[in-house]
């Protein structure tokens, strides 16, 4: 007696999909795949599967339901911070092949890495034309100001909203300031924190307010406070540079921009007699701080005049440094003062047309705005490698 | 709270235009796609028109296509949809509803009456 | 154009019992990970309400009575028990593509 069984039913592939191998019949032990095009998977039910393989069983039937090729999804976009998702494909649309826009808040914010655009590709992934599977970023445009030059803060005036935006006040112990840098770190000067350099929390940090003693400001707080390793307290004021790490993000508007780091070229805006521009709340002529932000339009001093400035007595040898700027004028009347510590001495680029910091307030005269003598700053653009390093490693 | 407001409805005559607006609050209007969906006396929803977050992808119902304009102002957080060339069967209750995927807010509506 | 077909148009279901509502569509409006088929309820003189997304994911502060399922094209939506307040008329919705359709509705009248 003998049985031949029987052969199983034709596969049908699924939509989007192919059997192999192609066969006249499949009998006892015959066997094919199912293989997904580009940009579908296997799903049997709502499972998807690695692969599929049926076996032709004796009763003539396959050991395994025919699976799906289902379309691809790489589900909603990830938000981004500052910035939005556009479908461009249709609304909603997260299916192989599909476009999103990606595109950063208008005005105070640029998109860094890529162009935004991104699309859904068969592994799942939203994919940008580079190939990037992560986000772009969203980098809040710096230098940005109500004013647009350096015109004529002690001998100073009175600021304008959106004039100084990126100016901090900082309380902690003293009055000191700081430059907002990006939108969660401070530049500010290492003499200014250098007490609470092991207490970061204790620093109050305000900004996006004119006003000292405003109630309505932008509160942050210090995650951590970073010295410059060549600084010494109590020994002269090279490196007097400094970084606090925000513990969140701020959020830019006109009032709250930060202040541009110094490209290479940026020495051309810098020579002897430029005009920079301090602003604080440090010490006015009446020998009180600034109950209002205030600023003056200073220039730069010769660096071996202003050198020859505080080499006499009672300062000592060589306390003005190669990291350091001088401003003012000769005749007084014009400088920074005690509780501007900190806070930036900007200039206006007039090739990307925004304000960089090239000076940290630091120190001077125990007399502001005397005549013969100068304000110094900590000279910023030789320590941008020092700065990019703690703001990439942090 | 989120909010949408609609405006503009009324009595037009067939082949005339109106422009309807939603004004939205409670929340980032520019970060939501926003769409325009109708009703019908005594009848079922019809999805409209869609518009992107930024505004640079829209995508209209054939039987509104060429004849219905759909467009956003994020500065004043307010869509519009202009319509031309209207017709009997335009009349209903026309809604604003937030949300790329799906319609997650709607407005209370404004009503469109075409009649001569 | 997808077309969605649900049914019935209109059902009455005594108060504290389960109502079932149908939705089929014309394609599959599922994905390998998504399946976007959404309901809503309408109430005479007001506008729509989601109540579920994704064909089962309920939408915040829907009651858990409210429960949906199905995937490929069919999908269902259930009710229990059912309550006084949930006269209204029901909706599926797809945003498989554009345009994005609705059913026809479906009349729920509580006995």
């Known amino acids: 007696y003998t049985s031949t069984a029987q052969p199983c039913p034709y596969p049908m592939a699924p939509p989007n999909g192919h059997v192999s191998p192609v066969q006249a019949k499949y009998i006892l032990k015959d066997s094919f795949s199912i293989f997904c095009e580009t940009g579908y998977e296997l799903l049997q039910g709502h499972l998807p599967l690695k692969s599929f393989t049926a076996v032709c069983q004796k009763d003539g039937s396959w050991d395994r339901p025919m699976p799906a090729c289902s379309i691809v999804d790489c589900g909603p976009p990830d938000d981004l911070p500052s910035g939005r998702v556009e479908y461009i494909t249709g609304p909603g649309v997260t299916t192989y092949k599909a476009v999103i826009q990606y595109s950063c808040e208008e005005t105070f914010y640029t998109m860094k890495v890529n162009d935004g655009k991104y699309v859904c590709e068969a592994d799942g992934f939203w994919t940008s034309s580079k190939g990037e599977k992560s986000l772009p970023v969203c980098e809040p445009v710096c230098g940005l100001s109500a004013r647009t030059t350096g015109g004529r803060i002690y001998g100073g005036q009175k600021a304008k909203p959106g004039d100084f935006p990126w100016q901090v006040l900082i309380l902690g112990g003293t009055t000191a300031a700081g430059a907002l840098l990006y939108d969660n770190w401070v530049l500010t000067a290492a003499h200014a924190v250098y007490e609470q350099k092991h207490d970061a929390s204790a620093l109050d940090i305000r900004m996006g307010t004119l006003k000292r003693l405003s109630p309505h400001y932008t509160q942050a707080w210090s995650e951590a406070v970073f010295i410059h390793e060549g600084y010494t307290h109590d020994a002269g004021f090279d490196n007097d540079i400094a970084l606090i790490k925000l513990n969140n993000k701020v959020v830019i508007n006109s009032n709250i921009t930060p202040i541009c780091l110094p490209r290479k070229e940026a020495e051309s805006f810098m020579r002897t007699d430029d005009i920079g521009t301090a602003s604080g709340w440090g010490l006015t002529q009446r020998g009180f701080l600034a109950r209002n932000l205030m600023y003056v339009d200073i220039p730069i001093v010769d660096h071996q005049k202003c050198t020859a400035a505080y080499e006499k007595p009672p300062y000592p040898r060589g306390s003005v440094t190669a990291n350091m700027l001088c401003a003012g004028l000769e005749s007084g009347g014009k400088d920074s003062c005690r509780g501007d510590s900190g806070g930036a001495l900007v200039f206006l680029d007039s090739e990307t047309e925004r304000w960089f910091v090239g000076g940290i307030v630091s120190w001077g005269s125990m007399n502001c705005g005397e005549a013969g003598q100068y304000g110094v700053y900590t000279k910023v653009i030789n320590y941008i490698p020092w700065i990019e390093n703690i703001i990439s490693d942090f | 709270d989120v909010q949408l407001v609609e405006s503009g409805g009324g009595l037009v005559q067939p082949g005339g235009s109106r422009k309807l607006s939603c004004a939205a609050s409670?929340?980032?209007?520019?970060?939501?796609?926003i769409h325009w969906v109708r009703q019908a006396p005594e009848k079922g929803l019809e999805w409209v028109a869609y518009?992107?977050?930024?505004?640079?992808?829209?995508f209209y119902a054939d039987t509104v296509k060429g004849r219905f304009t759909i467009s956003r102002d994020n500065s004043k957080n307010t869509l519009f949809l202009q319509m031309t060339s209207l017709r009997s069967e335009d009349t209903a209750i026309y809604y604003c509803?937030?949300?790329?995927?799906?319609?997650?807010?709607w407005g209370q509506g404004t009503t469109l009456t075409v009649s001569s | 154009d997808i077309v969605l077909t649900q049914s019935p148009a209109s059902l009455a279901v005594s108060l504290g019992q389960r109502a079932t509502i149908s939705c089929r569509a014309s394609?599959?409006?599922?994905?390998?990970?998504?399946?976007?088929i959404h309901w809503y309820q309408q109430k005479p003189g007001q506008p729509p309400r989601l109540l579920i997304k994704?064909?089962?994911n309920l939408e915040s502060g829907v009651p858990a009575r409210f429960s949906g399922s199905g995937s490929g094209t069919d999908f269902t939506l259930n009710i229990h028990p059912v309550e006084e307040e949930d006269t209204a008329t029901y909706y599926c919705?797809?945003?498989?593509?554009?345009?994005?359709?609705f059913g026809g509705g479906t009349k729920l009248e509580i006995k």
């Open positions: 509803a937030k949300s790329d995927r799906y319609f997650d807010y």
């Open positions: 409670g929340f980032t209007f520019s970060n939501f796609g």
């Open positions: 518009i992107s977050s930024g505004g640079s992808a829209v």
């Open positions: 394609q599959s409006v599922s994905s390998s990970s998504y399946r976007y």
């Open positions: 994704y064909a089962s």
């Open positions: 919705q797809h945003s498989w593509e554009t345009p994005w359709t």
